[in-house]
């Protein structure tokens, strides 16, 4: 996990809110865990950050992620008249200047240092999945979600016409 004291004191002050020229609706500092209660952790290795999915020891502190919420028109805008509604989108930042990115070519989720405006690869459509869970769909690749594969985060294609268990794309957000 990050050994950066600033992470736990993460506030809006660390982020100017001009991402893609829009201000977030709100921001939320939370720990991220899987449906099976494994923690998402971030480690600095060889000057780059790695993302892990692991069981924490009893009193080990969970890493926090700053979620910035945005509203966005549905990309397909199927109706053509805006009635399709606005989606909630998020960016996820575990430490200053670093954001989760979707690498669609490698089907991987990576932490990139980047400047504003953030690229579309840093934005995820937030899905409500009952049982206090959410899912993160790539803005750049509809139908592709952040998921867990081999104790790492990966991009997973979800076919809504398939009847499959989606537990590996379910995440819990917690303030503790």
């Amino acid at each position: 996990a990050f050994g950066i004291s600033g992470v736990q004191k993460y506030t809006r002050a660390l982020h100017d809110s001009s991402i893609t020229g829009i201000s977030p609706i709100t921001e939320y500092l939370a720990s991220l865990s899987t449906y099976n209660d494994q923690s998402i952790t971030f480690a600095l290795e060889d000057e780059s950050y790695e993302i892990y999915v692991e069981d924490l020891k009893k009193d080990e502190k969970k890493d926090k992620v700053l979620l910035s919420y945005y509203e966005s028109q549905h990309p397909s805008n199927e109706s053509g008249d805006g009635v399709d509604g606005k989606m909630l989108m998020v960016t996820l930042s575990p430490t200053k200047d670093f954001w989760l990115h979707a690498n669609n070519k490698e089907h991987s989720v990576e932490l990139h240092k980047c400047e504003k405006p953030l690229p579309d690869q840093a934005f995820f459509v937030l899905h409500n999945m009952h049982s206090n869970c959410v899912s993160f769909e790539c803005k750049t690749d509809p139908g592709v979600f952040i998921g867990v594969k081999d104790n790492h985060l990966a991009l997973i294609k979800v076919d809504s016409s398939e009847n499959l268990c989606t537990e590996n794309i379910l995440f819990k957000l917690s303030e503790t």
């Epitope: 979620l67 009635v83 937030l126 999945m129 009952h130 206090n132 809504s160 398939e162 989606t166």
Partner: antibody
Framework: EVKLEESGGGLVQPGGSMKLSCVAS????????MNWVRQSPEKGLEWMAE??????????HYAESVKGRFSISRDDSKSTVYLQMNNLRAEDTGIYYC????????????WGAGTTVTVSS | DIVLTQSPTSLAVSLGQRATISCRAS??????????LNWFQQKPGQPPKLLIF???SQGSGVPARFSGSGSGTDFSLNIHPVEEDDTAMYFC?????????FGGGTKLEIK
């Protein structure tokens, strides 16, 4: 044009059954959670039932007052959602709206015009 | 269940003035750092129409005259300046927990 059209309402006796249908058009039906909401002068707007997507195993949720009596289902090939209502009571009288949640499933943003159900002897 | 109490049950506002409708929840409707409180407008013979979602975000195509605020248990819908066409019933609704619940409604008349 995004549209929801309910049918199947009418007059039914207490204890009777009725099946409501709602046909959707103008959007990819299989991508959206669907709901039934009813409205009566006595109880106002009441959420009744919800059905999720195929990849959520079509999980369903119900208001306590209709659990065990009402059943929501969908047929994605027909872009239709149904509400099977059994053991109907006088208090089930009202306008029944079919409603679609937004993409991402945070709020209802498309409603049908409604169909009226009257439970009376 | 989360109970939503709206006030007032009816109000009459002069054209061009401000209308404020309150909605109080029996417990917090906050989750994931957001407030899952929506506002709907309903005119006679029509289904409800979404105005505001997650407490303060405007629905698609909703005029800027409509704004929402609040968090936790206390919320309000503001309409300013009110227009003739705003005569309607207004409902708050929570989408945090099942069963999703609605407020009892507020009838707005324009003087």
């Amino acid at each position: 044009e995004v549209k929801l059209e309910e049918s199947g309402g009418g007059l039914v006796q207490p204890g009777g059954s009725m099946k409501l249908s709602c046909v959707a058009s103008g959007f990819t039906f299989s991508n959206y959670w669907m709901n039934w909401v009813r409205q009566s002068p006595e109880k106002g707007l009441e959420w009744m039932a919800e059905i999720t997507l195929k990849f959520n195993n079509y999980s369903t949720h119900y208001a306590e007052s209709v659990k065990g009596r009402f059943s929501i289902s969908r047929d994605d090939s027909k872009s239709t959602v149904y509400l099977q209502m059994n053991n109907l009571r006088a208090e089930d009288t009202g306008i029944y709206y079919c409603a679609r949640r937004n993409y991402g499933d945070w709020y209802i943003n498309v409603w049908g015009a409604g169909t009226t159900v009257t439970v009376s002897s | 269940d989360i109970v939503l109490t709206q006030s007032p049950t009816s109000l009459a506002v002069s054209l061009g003035q401000r209308a404020t409708i309150s909605c109080r929840a029996s417990e917090s409707v906050d989750k994931f750092g957001m407030s899952f409180l929506n506002w709907f407008q309903q005119k006679p013979g029509q289904p409800p129409k979404l105005l505001i979602f997650v407490a303060s975000s405007q629905g698609s195509g909703v005029p800027a005259r409509f704004s929402g605020s609040g968090s936790g248990t206390d919320f309000s819908l503001n309409i300013h300046p009110v227009e003739e066409d705003d005569t309607a019933m207004y409902f708050c609704q929570q989408s945090k927990d099942i069963p999703y619940t609605f407020g009892g409604g507020t009838k707005l008349e324009i003087k």
